[in-house]
Interface confidence: low
């Protein structure tokens, strides 16, 4: 009588995670009579896949008909792999009794589950801070199997050097996670920016996933303003015109007062945006000059993103009228500007009200 | 987690039929099988048969295999019973219990439901 | 079929005392190196709640005051220390073959 032999072919099989896996086993003769079992590792802690004549697996099928006669391939198909099935599958033969007796065991295919990365996802800041800030961005990267992974971050496509990538957990696992956070430093040049985390994986064929976060969420471009006083118009009006430019974001309330009295509130909206994505807003106040006996001080306060408010004022000189044009009257700031350098090319867009 | 809502009570004649349900909710349904099990007043537990939603496999106990029928609807994720021929001594609460191990074991039951047969 | 017997039918123990019901198979429910044989309790008008798996393991949630054993044809159900709440009748099933019930055993409070 010639000894059973378990065939099992493929030392190891590689799947994708939700495909199926095709474990083969033949025997090399009928005898003895009895089951195919289908065992998760080995020793007494193994774990039972497939019984080939009792209990029932519902993600387990034979691939041939295992009743047919003289049937010796024992195949298994498993479906709807996920990176927990990994491990070494044995097709082993058992001999009919009562219990069953194993007689051989294959010599194990070991099947490893592919899982992709889910999309990064990248947050940032929960509050805005100015040009030569750092801010941090964090991406996260779930479900991925192997352990072995990528990350990358850009900004505007040039890739940073400053972040910082954990894989948890650091044992073996069914499952990997990524967690990277990268640290930036803004510009006021950031607004239209955008920050990108790259991840690379075994899965992915070369075609890495990537998660985006706009640098308009996490950065605020404070507002300039000068305040200046237009050629002087008929009937004793001085036009005093606040330009506030190079604004981000766009939530801005402007309020004029009149000797410290507020003479009317404004808040920005629909503004165009500057090609750098910030905003200029121009709005100017008559002055009648005839109405009043001493100087007007005319103060031009600015509430940007519900930060302190910022304040430029600017004196009418009523004895200066109505025989001067405003070229001697002086303009004085009485608040502090949060940024330093000089307004540029951008052209201003004048909205009059 | 895991829940079967099974139909409420009915009262039958003897020789009617009645068609038992089993709603599944919080895994897989076509993934393991369905179980049902009967319960006398006062008497022990008894298995009427079992079915897999993935491919409506039926096992049945030889005492019911003329009268039950088991269905399953993988669309709504609910297993049907349905006993015809009613006597008097079908009066039982009726189970449906799930197979979380495929061990044919049944790791999760419903309610029940209480059918009563009399004339 | 494989006919389970539980002994004994009806059981009365003192709160903390050791309980042991048995459930004797008519063959044995032993295959490809586990014993298919399970416990059930079922308080009154409630379902049954599986105890035991495969002869030996407790279920998830199960106290550890709950223990079974046996192999081949015997098996045993032991409660280490009778609780109150653990007054109810208790179920041996196997699936050998296709599944049957042992008859019950009522155990009560002495």
């Known amino acids: 009588e010639e000894e059973l032999q378990v065939i099992q072919p493929e030392k190891s099989v590689s799947v994708a995670a939700g495909d199926s896996a095709t474990l083969n086993c033949t025997v090399t003769s009928l005898i003895p009579v009895g089951p195919i079992q289908w065992f998760r590792g080995a020793g007494p802690g193994r774990e039972l896949i497939y019984h080939q004549k009792e209990g029932h697996f519902p993600r387990v099928t034979s691939v041939s008909e295992s009743t047919k006669r003289n049937n010796m391939d024992f195949s298994i198909h498993i479906s709807n792999i996920t990176p927990a099935d990994a491990g070494t599958y044995y097709c082993v033969k058992f001999r009919k009794g009562s219990p069953d007796v194993e007689v051989k065991s294959g010599a194990g295919t070991e099947l490893s589950v592919r899982a992709k990365p889910s999309a990064p996802v990248v947050s940032g800041p929960a509050v805005r801070a100015t040009a030569e800030h750092t801010v941090s961005f964090t991406c996260e990267s779930h479900g991925f199997s192997p352990r072995d992974i990528t990350l990358k971050w850009f900004k505007n496509g040039n890739e940073l050097s400053d972040f910082q990538t954990n894989v948890d957990p650091a044992g073996k696992s069914v499952s990997y996670s990524i967690r990277s956070t990268a640290r930036v430093v803004l510009t006021r040049r950031d607004v239209h920016s955008q920050v990108i985390c790259e991840v690379a994986h075994v899965t992915l064929q070369g075609d890495p996933l990537r998660g985006t976060a706009n640098l308009s969420e996490a950065i605020r471009v404070p507002p300039f303003l000068e305040v200046t006083q237009q050629s002087m118009r008929a009937d004793n009006q001085v036009n005093v015109t606040c330009q506030v430019t190079k604004f981000y974001p766009q939530r801005l309330q402007l309020t004029w007062l009149e000797n410290g009295n507020v003479s009317r509130t404004e808040m920005a909206s629909a503004l165009p945006e500057n090609k750098d994505g910030t905003y200029n807003w121009t709005s100017w106040l008559l002055v009648n000059v005839s109405a009043h006996r001493d100087d007007v001080k005319l103060t031009c306060q600015v509430e940007h993103d519900g930060q302190p408010a910022v304040n430029k004022s600017f004196s009418v000189k009523v004895s200066a009228h109505p025989k001067e044009q405003g070229s001697n009257t002086a303009a004085e700031n009485t608040g502090t500007n949060e940024r330093d350098y000089k307004d540029d090319d951008d052209k201003h867009h004048h909205h009059h009200h | 987690q895991v829940q079967l809502v099974q139909s409420g009570a009915e009262v039958k004649k003897p020789g009617a039929s009645v068609k038992v349900s089993c709603k599944a909710s919080?895994?897989?349904?076509?993934?393991?099988?369905i179980n049902w099990v009967r319960q006398a007043p006062g008497q022990g537990l008894e298995w009427i048969a079992m079915?897999?939603?993935?491919?409506?496999?039926?096992h049945y106990n030889q005492i019911f295999k003329d009268r039950a029928t088991l269905t399953t609807d993988t669309s709504t994720s609910t297993a049907y019973m349905e006993l015809r021929s009613l006597r008097s001594d079908d009066t039982a609460v009726y189970y449906c219990?799930?197979?979380?191990?495929?061990?044919?074991?049944?790791?999760?039951w419903g309610r029940g439901t209480l059918v009563t047969v009399s004339s | 079929d494989i006919v389970l017997t539980q002994s004994p039918d009806s059981l009365a123990v003192s709160l903390g005392e050791r309980a042991t019901i048995n459930c004797r198979a008519s063959?044995?429910?032993?295959?490809?190196?586990?014993?298919?044989l399970f416990w059930y309790q079922q308080k009154p008008g409630q379902p049954p709640k599986l105890l035991i798996y495969?002869?030996?393991n407790r279920d998830s949630g199960v106290p550890d005051r709950f223990s079974g054993s046996g192999s081949g044809t015997d098996f045993t159900l032991t409660i280490s220390s009778l609780q109150a709440e653990d007054v109810a009748v208790y179920y041996c099933?196997?699936?050998?073959?296709?599944?049957?019930f042992g008859q019950g055993t009522k155990l009560e409070i002495k």
């Open positions: 219990a799930m197979d979380y191990g495929s061990l044919y074991a049944m790791d999760y």
């Open positions: 919080g895994y897989t349904f076509t993934n393991y099988w």
């Open positions: 079915i897999d939603p993935s491919d409506s496999e039926t």
């Open positions: 063959k044995s429910v032993g295959s490809s190196g586990y014993n298919w």
């Open positions: 495969l002869a030996s």
């Open positions: 099933q196997h699936s050998r073959e296709l599944p049957t």
